[in-house]
Interface confidence: low
């Protein structure tokens, strides 16, 4: 896995480059889990949808994630997370049009109705971690990212390479 | 449709304790802060602390830490807030309210408001 | 921690005025919620995150600022809007204005 300065120094290099407009190499349609295994799941409330992470019970159906992935422009300097050298991101939607988001100012993950060509902070660095597990870094943001805080997503800052593999960062995705 | 259900009003001594309690429905309440607030007559309103139903993380302010407990019961969707060691300053309403969002941290509002319930201390 | 001011405390207006509260936060916040509470009520959502309307609010109601200084606009005051208005904003925890009573003139 790629060390935190290689991380940032990518995702920086992300930001002269527009790949909003790219379409993405593959899509994947997936469960999303903590490393702890409580599922990740989306509902319909207040008007607008809400993130949950939570024990299913065993009858209970996950929710499927499409993640969309797109091969970055920009060669990286080290290997181990990307195709080729070359780094990849997604796109996370749970249902039709609307996408996670990363709210950097309030530390919040979030989902927003939006339209093609998708903005910068609906894009997240993948990382292929230990234990068939993956984490999500923030394009926006680099050293931010995806975790679980008290049982809901938040956008969380990691600050040295050691905390890359720390579980609540970690997610594993699965086809059933 | 969402909605919090305190306890009746209560007089009490000083120094005794008052244990309020917030029920409610219409979501997923292990999912949700629930924050707890209070109103002295004619005053503006003053956050006493908040919890999580999910884990049972809660956060208390500064001036009530030590005389507040806050928690809650997933089994029935009702949260409670233990006031103790009573004075004659603690006479207010206090109010159960949950967040707008059950994830992020700062800037997730307060969306819903209990219908508050009266504590008056009195000898 | 921040703290929020709001003035002024408390204002006269007549039905089909104009008027402005603003809160001003002790350090820079990302966004700033508004809520109205009626004697003997408990407060209700008007605008959260600076200027989005809660459900149900009229469209006379308004928000707008950003860093320090936000303010609650009322473009034409309603019978129904004489109350109490109040701020709030803060990271880790709500943290709250002092309120402006809005009285009838």
């Known amino acids: 896995a790629f060390g935190i300065s290689g991380v940032q120094k990518y995702t920086r290099a992300l930001h002269d480059s527009s790949i909003t407009g790219i379409s993405p190499i593959t899509e994947y349609l997936a469960s999303l889990s903590t490393y702890n295994d409580q599922s990740i799941t989306f509902a319909l409330e207040d008007e607008s949808y809400e993130i949950y992470v939570e024990d299913l019970k065993k009858d209970e159906k996950k929710d499927k994630v499409l993640l969309s992935y797109y091969e970055s422009q920009h060669p990286s300097n080290e290997s181990g997370d990307g195709v080729d050298g070359k780094m990849l991101m997604v796109t996370l939607s749970p249902t039709k049009d609307f996408w996670l988001h990363a709210n950097n100012k309030e530390h919040s993950v979030e989902l927003h109705k939006c339209e093609k060509p998708l903005p910068d902070q609906a894009f997240f660095v993948l990382h292929n971690m230990h234990s068939n597990c993956v984490s999500f870094e923030c394009k926006t943001d680099p050293g931010v990212f995806i975790g679980v805080k008290d049982n809901h997503l938040a956008l969380i800052k990691v600050d040295s390479s050691e905390n890359l593999c720390t579980e609540n960062i970690l997610f594993k995705l699965s086809e059933t | 449709e969402v909605q919090l259900v305190q306890s009746g009003a209560e007089v009490k001594k000083p120094g005794a304790s008052v244990k309020v309690s917030c029920k409610a429905s219409?979501?997923?309440?292990?999912?949700?802060?629930i924050q707890w607030v209070r109103q002295a007559p004619g005053q503006g309103l003053e956050w006493m602390g908040e919890?999580?139903?999910?884990?049972?993380?809660?956060y208390y302010s500064e001036k009530f830490k030590g005389r507040v407990t806050m928690t809650t019961d997933t089994s029935t969707s009702t949260a409670y807030m233990e006031l103790r060691s009573l004075r004659s300053d603690d006479t207010a309403v206090y109010y159960c309210?949950?967040?707008?969002?059950?994830?992020?941290?700062?800037?997730?509002?307060?969306?819903?408001w209990g219908q508050g319930t009266l504590v008056t201390v009195s000898s | 921690d921040i703290q929020l001011t709001q003035s002024p405390s408390s204002v006269s207006a007549s039905v089909g005025d104009r008027v402005t509260i603003t809160c001003s936060a002790t350090?820079?916040?990302?966004?700033m919620h508004w809520h109205q509470q009626k004697p003997g009520k408990a407060p209700k959502l008007l605008i959260y995150?600076?200027?989005n309307l809660a459900s149900g609010v009229p469209s006379r109601f308004s928000g707008s600022g950003s860093g320090t200084d936000y303010t609650l606009t009322i473009s034409s005051l309603q019978p129904e809007d004489f109350a109490t208005y109040y701020c709030?904003?803060?990271?880790?925890?709500?943290?709250f204005g002092g309120g402006t009573k809005v009285e009838i003139k």
């Open positions: 219409g979501f997923r309440f292990k999912n949700y802060w």
């Open positions: 709030s904003g803060g990271y880790s925890h709500p943290t």
């Open positions: 350090s820079s916040v990302s966004s």
């Open positions: 995150r600076t200027s």
């Open positions: 309210a949950r967040k707008h969002r059950g994830y992020g941290y700062g800037g997730a509002w307060i969306a819903y």
């Open positions: 919890i999580f139903p999910g884990t049972g993380t809660s």
